[in-house]
Interface confidence: low
């Protein structure tokens, strides 16, 4: 029987998105085991090592070149079929990265996303990419693909992610490809961490000696909760730079972190979040906002939370 149930399953490990010079292993799983198989490549670009060759269990491509990029299928050994081989497997697309300059990846309105809400991840470049691909770290399935939109000398694509949940949080990268070589991707964008907020109770945020301070006076923001958070994150409204500190268990059974802002020079509205070590991309609801007001010099003495907003240092707003 050559029906759908009798097709082999072709997989790429560790990922089908491979840097040029890297390695990828193709495995053809057939009839509950890895056995002898033949590989087929859709575009028939000549890769001498596997033309007409029978592989045992797996095929390791290393070092990967642009010639390896393409759409693969396998056939498993099947002694009872007229040809001796099974029906073709599912296709696996090997995408080879590092062939163009990296694009930029931005989150709008920002990388901290409330549970149930949506975030737009925008990939953009001054290279006229025809397609953009979005890939989440640790996911083996094919990256999401969108056609690039060209405007004002920039090509871009907006990937909508959501409704937000823990499974969607993580580290994202995007890639671009040009028309004639759709499986040859750019270098990856700088990684962007998308964090889901809201599944845990909000911590409380307070200021010592108080939220109204004179310029030059030292101020410390304390984030605390009865929840046993491992880490606290302090952010300032209108900005993406956040500071994090490990939580310390206090005698009153609360878990607290004290953020010294140093001699106060810069007011603003602050919030803090709690998170657990086992789930770094999942943060609590934000604390109630705390307005710190400073009379005097407006310059900032600790890394300004207004800049930058993504891993590459790009501004958060969409282009």
């Amino acid at each position: 029987h050559m029906g759908g149930q009798d097709k082999p399953f072709l997989s790429a490990w560790p990922s089908a998105v491979v840097p040029r010079g890297g390695h990828v292993t193709l495995r053809c799983h057939y009839r509950h085991r890895f056995n002898n198989f033949m590989l087929y490549k859709e575009d028939r670009i000549h890769i001498p090592i596997f033309h007409g060759r029978i592989f045992q269990e797996s095929f390791n491509m290393s070092p990967v070149t642009t010639a390896h990029a393409g759409n693969y299928t396998c056939r498993g050994s099947h002694p009872h079929s007229p040809t001796g081989w099974s029906a073709p497997s599912n296709p696996v697309v090997i995408m080879v990265t590092g062939n163009h300059r990296k694009p930029s990846l931005l989150a709008h309105p920002g990388p901290l996303v409330k549970s149930g809400e949506r975030v737009i991840l925008q990939c953009w470049s001054d290279i006229m990419f025809e397609h953009f691909f979005l890939h989440k770290e640790g996911i083996s399935k094919d990256p999401s693909r969108l056609v690039g939109q060209i405007h004002d000398g920039v090509s871009k694509a907006n990937f909508s992610i959501g409704p937000m949940m823990l499974a969607l949080a993580g580290t994202y990268r995007c890639y671009g490809s040009v028309t004639h070589t759709p499986y040859q991707l750019s270098a990856p964008s700088d990684p962007l961490d998308i964090v889901v907020t809201g599944p845990y109770e909000k911590p409380s945020l307070s200021a010592q000696p108080g939220p109204k301070v004179q310029a030059g006076e030292s101020v410390t923001l304390s984030c605390s909760s009865r929840s046993s958070y491992d880490m606290y994150h302090l952010s300032r409204e209108g900005g993406a730079h956040e500071r994090r500190l490990p939580a310390v268990r206090k005698v009153n059974r609360t878990f607290q972190a004290d953020f010294p802002l140093g001699p106060a020079t810069h007011g603003g509205t602050y919030r803090c979040f709690g998170s657990f070590r086992h789930s770094p991309y999942e943060w609590s609801d934000p604390s109630d906002p705390l307005l710190v007001s400073v009379t005097g010099n407006p310059s900032s003495s600790w890394p300004s939370p207004t800049e930058p907003s993504s891993k590459s240092g790009n501004p958060r707003h969409l282009h």
Partner: antibody, heavy 123, light 106 residues
């Protein structure tokens, strides 16, 4: 490719002010922060301050009262101004681009540097 | 402010050999340390960031490791062009450099 190039007066008298320009190419000042770092003769590197992509600044707290960093995005130029110069401000002054491999906590290292410009404070 | 204590301040080594430089932070810097090579008349060159991530184009002879407050940087199979000064940089909270290590030929 990414390049940064500093230009400055070379020699400044004590108590006077300093202005150094960093001209960048290969990236946009609206996308990356630029830091200033100096190295006095025979000593190590000291971080002075940064101007972020959006124009906000941070300064080394010990020098904050004497430092000012600004930029002109259209000209791809960043400016370091320092007043009340003393002999111990004699140093090689570098500009460097800030970049990061993490969003979480936005930790920024310096990935590209200029070749530096020498400043001597002397009468 | 975080202080970075880099040691040794100078180091004699043989070509083809291996050297290790250490940096100790005054507090936990969460692996946010970078290592730079600095040759006279040039700007520092980024070799490693986030403790052990090699910058593209940097040979694998260079490596870094560590956690908490203690970090190290090694060069194996030392080549003539490696003989210069090296700095660590913490970027966990603002930015602080170590005092530098000058590498010399034995």
């Amino acid at each position: 490719q990414v390049q940064l190039k500093e230009s400055g007066p070379g020699l400044v008298a004590p108590s006077q002010s300093l202005s150094i320009t960093c001209t960048v190419s290969g990236f946009s000042l609206t996308s990356f922060g630029v830091h200033w770092v100096r190295q006095p003769p025979g000593k190590g590197l000291e971080w002075l301050g940064v101007i972020w992509a959006g124009g906000s600044t941070n300064y080394n707290s010990a020098l904050m009262s004497r430092l000012s960093i600004s930029k002109d995005n259209s000209k791809s130029q960043v400016f370091l101004k320092m007043n009340s110069l003393q002999n111990d401000d004699t140093a090689m002054y570098y500009c460097a681009r800030g970049n990061s491999n993490h969003y979480v906590s936005s930790f920024y290292y310096f990935d590209y540097w200029g070749q530096g410009t020498t400043l001597t404070v002397s009468s | 402010d975080i202080q970075m204590t880099q040691s040794p301040s100078s180091l004699s080594a043989s070509l083809g050999g291996k050297v290790t430089i250490t940096c100790k932070a005054s507090q936990d810097i969460n692996k946010y340390i970078a290592w730079y090579q600095h040759k006279p008349g040039k700007g520092p060159r980024l070799l490693i960031h986030y403790t052990s991530t090699l910058q593209p184009g940097i040979p694998s002879r260079f490596s870094g490791s560590g956690s908490g407050r203690d970090y190290s940087f090694s060069i194996s199979n030392l080549e003539p062009e490696d003989i210069t000064t090296y700095y660590c940089l913490q970027y966990d909270n603002l930015w602080t450099f170590g005092g530098g290590t000058k590498l010399e030929i034995k």
